[in-house]
């Protein structure tokens, strides 16, 4: 003989668990019928009548099957330095994200931005390094042999010096070499390619913001170790 | 208006059965998601609940009192009856029956009444 | 069965005072606590169900919180019209009441 199906509620045999999208229900120790996403238990079932399910208000949602008698609210709109990514709906909540040029320091457990900060920019002898840091913020990198940064940005890699037949100035992590210019007479001898040595560089970024976890981290090119720095206040 | 209201003997003598009725208006017991249920307090105690029944006749009782209570329903006269077997001077309190909502709590109650259990 | 312990079992405060009533269950309740407010010779009456949901009409001077086993009923400056007997119930299984927190002024 085939099992009969039982619909719920119903008494679960003993030792057993209820079936997906099922509940037990401790209070009519029954399993009964969980609500869809999007909707919440109006009604908890009883050892007679199983759960009456309702559709979420406006502004508030239920993600999973679920025996909530309320629904979630909504995240609250994005701030002005945000864009919704996700609008709130029956099913989902809102979900928010920093505008270019900031990251998000404080993200909520649907993975919504609560807090945006405006990204950390590297000073001159540093680059943006190709990996983020655990929060999203930018990590800077001090500039390797032969490359520079001249400038103060959250986007800027280090760039290669330019190659000179002859060198007028050598570069170091914060400028570029200068070429001299070639002159007629020495047109014949062979080409010497001058790339030059970056001299020592201070390695603090510039333009922090106070806030939760925004201090970029600094990756040296001697190792794959990163320095912390540490901002501090004052000059 | 969602109104409750409890009557019964505010005298009964030890061994007895109390009977208590609960007379509501403002809402039906034939409604999904109806229920009515009973709780007391005795004299400078804590609320205690007794028992409860919904709109399809589902029961429930405290394990600790189960096998005294009886509780019933007559929806065409929106009344609740409980019924308490062997009264003894411990059950002595001022006995409510409350409204409870679809997702279980209590949210209307009457005015109670005494009930004193002596000899 | 669930028991629910509640303290203080009574309180004497100022008024404007913040005050703080709390209620451990026996296990988890998922969060299906209500709140009541009784006064002497009065109808006990709900202020919060589901944890945090305030009733209507209830002053926004009272909240709810907590989860799993242990929540808190807060009143954040209380008022001569608070003096009461607080109780939280259970009813995550069947119904429980705690023992009860009696409010007086200072």
């Known amino acids: 003989l085939p099992a009969q199906v039982a619909f719920t509620p119903y008494a679960p045999e003993p030792g057993s668990t209820c079936r997906l999208r099922e509940y037990y229900d401790q209070t009519a120790q029954m399993c009964c019928s969980k609500c869809s996403p999007g909707q919440h238990a109006k009604v908890f079932c009883t050892k007679t009548s199983d759960t009456v399910c309702d559709s979420c208000e406006d502004s508030t949602y239920t993600q999973l099957w679920n025996w909530v008698p309320e629904c979630l609210s909504c995240g609250s709109r994005c701030s002005s330095d945000q864009v919704e990514t996700q609008a709130c709906t029956r099913e989902q909540n809102r979900i928010c994200a920093c505008e270019a040029g900031r990251y998000c320091a404080l993200k909520t457990h649907s993975g919504s931005c609560r807090q945006c900060m405006r990204l950390s920019k590297c000073g001159p002898g540093f680059g943006v390094a190709s990996s983020r840091a655990p929060n999203g913020n930018v990590l800077c990198k001090a500039c390797a042999p032969g490359t520079f940064s001249d400038t103060t940005s959250s986007t800027d890699v280090c760039r290669p010096h330019r190659i000179c037949s002859i060198l007028a100035i050598p570069g170091n992590a914060s400028t570029d070499a200068v070429c001299a210019p070639e002159s007629p007479t020495l047109s014949a001898i062979p080409r010497t390619l001058y790339v030059s040595q970056p001299e020592p560089t201070r390695s603090q970024p510039l333009d922090q913001e106070p806030g939760p976890s925004q201090t970029p981290s600094i990756l040296t090119s001697l190792g794959s170790t990163p320095i912390i720095e540490q901002s501090t206040k004052g000059g | 208006q969602v109104t409750l209201k409890e009557s019964g003997p505010t005298l009964v003598k030890p061994t007895q059965t109390l009977t208590l009725t609960c007379t509501f208006s403002?809402?039906?017991?034939?409604?999904?998601?109806?229920?009515v249920g009973w709780i007391r307090q005795p004299p400078g105690k804590a609320l205690e609940w007794l028992a409860h029944?919904?709109?399809?006749?589902?029961?429930y009782y405290n394990p600790a009192l189960k096998s005294r209570l009886t509780i019933t329903k007559d929806t065409s006269k929106n009344q609740v009856v409980l019924t308490m077997t062997n009264m003894d001077p411990v059950d002595t309190a001022t006995y409510y029956c409350?409204?409870?909502?679809?997702?279980?709590?209590?949210?209307?109650w009457g005015q109670g009444t005494t009930v004193t259990v002596s000899s | 069965d669930i028991q629910m312990t509640q303290s203080p079992s009574s309180l004497s405060a100022s008024v404007g005072d913040r005050v703080t009533i709390t209620c451990k269950a026996s296990?988890?309740?998922?969060?299906?606590i209500a709140w009541y407010q009784h006064k002497p010779g009065k109808v006990p009456k709900l202020l919060i169900h589901?944890?945090?949901t305030l009733q209507p009409g209830v002053p926004s001077r009272f909240s709810g919180s907590g989860s799993g086993s242990d929540y808190t009923l807060t009143i954040s400056s209380l008022q001569p019209e608070d003096v009461a007997t607080y109780y939280c119930?259970?009813?995550?299984?069947?119904?429980?009441f705690g023992g009860g927190t009696k409010v007086e002024i200072k």
């Open positions: 409350a409204r409870m909502t679809g997702t279980r709590y209590f949210d209307v």
């Open positions: 403002g809402f039906s017991l034939s409604t999904l998601g109806m229920g």
């Open positions: 029944i919904w709109w399809d006749a589902d029961k």
């Open positions: 296990q988890n309740i998922n969060k299906f």
């Open positions: 589901y944890t945090s």
């Open positions: 119930l259970q009813y995550g299984v069947l119904w429980t």
